[in-house]
Interface confidence: low
Amino acid sequence: MSRGLQLLLLSCAYSLAPATPEVKVACSEDVDLPCTAPWDPQVPYTVSWVKLLEGGEERMETPQEDHLRGQHYHQKGQNGSFDAPNERPYSLKIRNTTSCNSGTYRCTLQDPDGQRNLSGKVILRVTGCPAQRKEETFKKYRAEIVLLLALVIFYLTLIIFTCKFARLQSIFPDFSKAGMERAFLPVTSPNKHLGLVTPHKTELV
């Protein structure tokens, strides 16, 4: 089999791999996150939920202890019992959702008659939450803003230095003409340059 065909088949197989299911909920509403672990007749299970952090780390607090952002997390399926017979057991109930609840959650099912562990992931997207306060937005993107400003200052310094060096070396002897100096104003003026380069807030999100 040719390498190209192998790569094509591999990419097809990858695209067919089951994606982590996503649950969308409107801000401040309650949501039931289903446990997507593969079901096995070894029941009843004891379920535990964790929220996965961006770095792959796990927030190890148990959801039923209400540690996650002060929200109320309710587990059905603990010790094989659940609230309503028509509801899927082992789901995670999050009340009064906020944008903080968005993220990836993992459920782990443990069988007391053998400790068989099964796990599944689900992504929660909380939509329609009011915009964050300006200081929160600034805190969130502080590193990006500082880096951007540093780059702007660096390029400004480089341009100014280049222009001065060029003038000193008389590379551009005719550039002292008024018309040409006016042409360079947008570049050499830091305020105007910043105005051209600084992205709008929407671009930072």
Partner: antibody, heavy 115, light 109 residues
């Protein structure tokens, strides 16, 4: 008391159908996976089929695939085994059992397939 | 699963041992080993004695014990009593389909 009470066993002709029932009591039936195991006369135990607590997952032994169907009615606390196209070698005592570890067993019901 | 011996005549009060060998490892991806032992007395339904290799079910006398790992497992009866007569089966719960051993008939000499 936790128990499984079976019914539905009978003498049937080859090619005919039969439905076995297993009524559960003394535990929350809807939270347990359930199994069917059979035992031919003078032989050992043979696993037949299993169903997850909510009926969404079903597993079968190769020799019954396409002929037998396992199902459950949680509100009625009852497990079923629908047996179609019965053959002489399906003659056995059929047991229902609870969860993957088969910790509780029914009393068994006899199915005889004979012409 | 292959059990041996298929027949085990024992003297009351003496120990008995039954072997169960699997053609493949019974260690699950979760690290656990799902090997159960059942007792079937004459004319009765099977009864589970041991689950997950060595865990005794409630109500099971402590003269019954299970051991082993991977593919080789053993059920031991430290002192056989008259009520222990019957057929003993091992069963694996790691792979689908579930499978039983052929059974070992324990009888008094």
């Amino acid at each position: 008391e936790v128990q499984l009470v079976q019914s539905g066993g009978a003498v049937v002709q080859p090619g005919r159908s039969l439905r076995l029932s297993c009524a559960a009591s003394g535990f929350t039936f809807s939270t347990y996976g359930m199994h069917w195991v059979r035992q031919a006369p003078g032989k050992g135990l043979e696993w037949v089929a299993a169903v997850s607590y909510d009926g969404s997952n079903k597993y079968y032994a190769d020799f019954v695939k396409g002929r037998f169907t396992i199902s459950r009615d949680n509100p009625k606390n009852t497990l079923y085994l629908q047996m179609n196209s019965l053959r002489a070698d399906d003659t056995a005592v059929y047991y229902c059992a609870r969860r993957g570890g088969l910790d509780i067993w029914g009393q068994g019901t006899t199915v005889t397939v004979s012409s | 699963l292959t059990q041996s011996p298929l027949s085990l005549p024992v003297t009351l009060g003496q120990p008995a041992s039954i072997s169960c060998k699997s053609s493949q490892s019974l260690v699950d991806s979760d690290g656990n080993t799902y090997l159960n032992w059942f007792q079937q007395r004459p004319g009765q339904s099977p009864r589970r004695l041991i689950y997950k290799v060595s865990n005794r079910d409630s109500g099971v006398p402590d003269r019954f014990s299970g051991s082993g790992s991977g593919t080789d497992f053993t059920l031991k009866i430290s002192r056989v009593e008259a009520e222990d007569v019957g057929v003993y089966y091992c069963m694996q719960g790691t792979h689908w389909p579930r499978t039983f051993g052929q059974g070992t008939k324990v009888e008094i000499k």
